[in-house]
Interface confidence: medium
Amino acid sequence: AVDLTLLANLRLTDPQRFFLTCVSGEAGAGRGSDAWGPPLLLEKDDRIVRTPPGPPLRLARNGSHQVTLRGFSKPSDLVGVFSCVGGAGARRTRVIYVHNSPGAHLLPDKVTHTVNKGDTAVLSARVHKEKQTDVIWKSNGSYFYTLDWHEAQDGRFLLQLPNVQPPSSGIYSATYLEASPLGSAFFRLIVRGCGAGRWGPGCTKECPGCLHGGVCHDHDGECVCPPGFTGTRCEQACREGRFGQSCQEQCPGISGCRGLTFCLPDPYGCSCGSGWRGSQCQEACAPGHFGADCRLQCQCQNGGTCDRFSGCVCPSGWHGVHCEKSDRIPQILNMASELEFNLETMPRINCAAAGNPFPVRGSIELRKPDGTVLLSTKAIVEPEKTTAEFEVPRLVLADSGFWECRVSTSGGQDSRRFKVNVKVPPVPLAAPRLLTKQSRQLVVSPLVSFSGDGPISTVRLHYRPQDSTMDWSTIVVDPSENVTLMNLRPKTGYSVRVQLSRPGEGGEGAWGPPTLMTTDCPEPLLQPWLEGWHVEGTDRLRVSWSLPLVPGPLVGDGFLLRLWDGTRGQERRENVSSPQARTALLTGLTPGTHYQLDVQLYHCTLLGPASPPAHVLLPPSGPPAPRHLHAQALSDSEIQLTWKHPEALPGPISKYVVEVQVAGGAGDPLWIDVDRPEETSTIIRGLNASTRYLFRMRASIQGLGDWSNTVEESTLGNGLQAEGPVQESRAAEEGLDQ
């Protein structure tokens, strides 16, 4: 899983002190905007829970792997969904934090619920401020279920979701009818794609048995470890106040991880840091409990003591999770929890063990995922340990998975599972891209999509003249920079190929497919001039031009006409592919538009000097705007529009077009036709209750006319959310918490 943590500071007495920090432990995280290291993104997600607009939140980057969001001015700013996105390419991951108002009517007993496919999920909303009205449950902002206030059990409203499937995942909320959505209890349901203990495409693979509350990822079988734990199976505790996949991060402030909520990639969700619990993560674990949210019990044996951050601390002579193993029993030492090798390499793997009696070479073995047992080729015996070295046969992809080092002596046995990732050296799927060319040089982008695994450590560009048998020239380049191939021959084709490498022995991939790049021909030098033009319709223009007379053949393949619409900031290009042409008809232009026009000669891909520009105004078309547009709310789902016909019409109106948009909404506007042009009013139905809308309209004769003024109006009351505006009544299924 991607090493990405979203931290929420829950000191809520003062919203201005609240902050969210997203920390990435990924190599090269957030380096910038290039394709090899996209930046960390941290934002409030307003798609489901919307809060009143306030001053914009402040985003501060601290180096390449940390970003912090501040500037919350009032408690309602905090309520809702926040997300952090990090990781590159296929590893791009979103971590989500859901914040509930501590003063809400309803509070979640538990915010994050991670369940397995097919399980029954039970969401429990605790009554904090009672109202004797129904409770509305929503799923991702859409109405889902109603509970009557009589249905509260022990001061809680329960929503049972049987046989859940991955699409059931999302944000659920429980709200008293007619209460502010900010007083809702918000939950996050994460449904793993497999049943308990399984992972993989067909859920055929067995999870490694994640310890200390780690959750098995349904796609890759890795354990997503709670904050404060590390290792393939989350078997190792970090030092107090540390988190991250390798315990490399430290909680800010003098009180360590107190008052912080940690959110990790799905399917983990969010929890307090190790050693803390409570809705604001400010309570230390009770005696005998430890770990994230204090969910784990120590049950130490043989005189072990319970540490709320790491679990059992064993006295001398004992080890194991519960101090249940005697030090006489052999023990695997310092085994890395994860190793990475490249495909078809033959790596050496070391496994060290200690114990009494002392382990010897033959007592340590290595077991591959397919059950094959490897015996060590040599052992280094030191006073405190024996290190066995294993020569691994040529690695294949099937060797990816959990390997096991096992030591057996008369004192007992120990084993340690570790993950081996067999990585495929990257092979370009596409040829490099030509950016620009001149007669003696080519500028090439080596960034191409590739099969296999990143990260890319080096990029080699190989090139030679086409059909040549001479050796390839090679240039090693930085993955993120464009390359200039210099000292080339003009008008010559070059075969160019990319080779990518990833870190580690055997990380060089095969060469990618070749592409032919041709150096340019001489550039055209003649400057045409515009002889004249005339308008042949509201959207058609006839243009003619000339070239100076020069001795010798014409260096050019054709002409490029350019029309620049300054008002809209749009350029239209028309290619005339004959160098003998001196006239062209331009069609499909925009009526009533002021264009700047020029023409230039081209040869191959090179453009000659442009003619002096001409300015052309096309005649307008389409009727004027309707007048005096007015909107009036009729109900919680209907708004009536009235208007007056445009003046000075050039012909009979065929229809009106109404544009509807939610005020402040990010979605596309909706256009509705009013097909009876004699009408001067219409009713827009199927709108959402208590929602502000913007309307404007225009008339159509042969073409669409100018837009009217924009009017704004809100629907009334509190009722069903509609499916969308229409001119006939229609009920709906979806809506947003406004």
Partner: antibody, heavy 113, light 115 residues
Amino acid sequence: EVQLLESGGGLVQPGGSLRLSCAASGFTFSSYKMGWVRQAPGKGLEWVSSIYPSGGWTHYADSVKGRFTISRDNSKNTLYLQMNSLRAEDTAVYYCARVLLHYFDYWGQGTLV
Amino acid sequence: QSVLTQPASVSGSPGQSITISCTGTSSDVGGYKYVSWYQQHPGKAPKLIISDVNNRPSGVSDRFSGSKSGNTASLTISGLQAEDDGDYYCSSYASSSYTSSTTWVFGGGTKLTVL
């Protein structure tokens, strides 16, 4: 295993009364909404009534409103339907069913009235 | 008279696919994603086979699938088998608003004959 067993059906004259019972087992009865659905001979299903877990909130089809009363005893895991002023058109097999969210997920075998 | 309209009967040969439609209004089928389907064999209680338009409860064959468009819901049974013979009822949760005035409406039922 969820089980629902109806009883109390029988022959009754128009204008008479009858009380149906439904004994529930295999699940936490007090946590679920429950309902009655009937089926006239050779005809389709018709929802009759439903009741919330606490018993404090009930709903009825228009055809039985004012004549039928649904109730429950959570301590006995039992659902009841008291039917008064019975009419010939109330003749049907009456099914007791557990309500989960927006549907009936388990049904009893029914009792004929 | 049932509130939701279903065809009285459909038939198909083993291995074929059939579809049963269920038409309501915007106050029931069209207004909610809460259509369920029940199978009933003669003399037996109804059995839930589809909930919430297209969700199959655990233990129900994946040959049964549901869908909805506008005011019409549909049940499709693929790879017909002799044991599919029986009556099929659609049902929709119906409510006038967000309040608890909850009702359920049923279709008149469709008799499926496997030839």
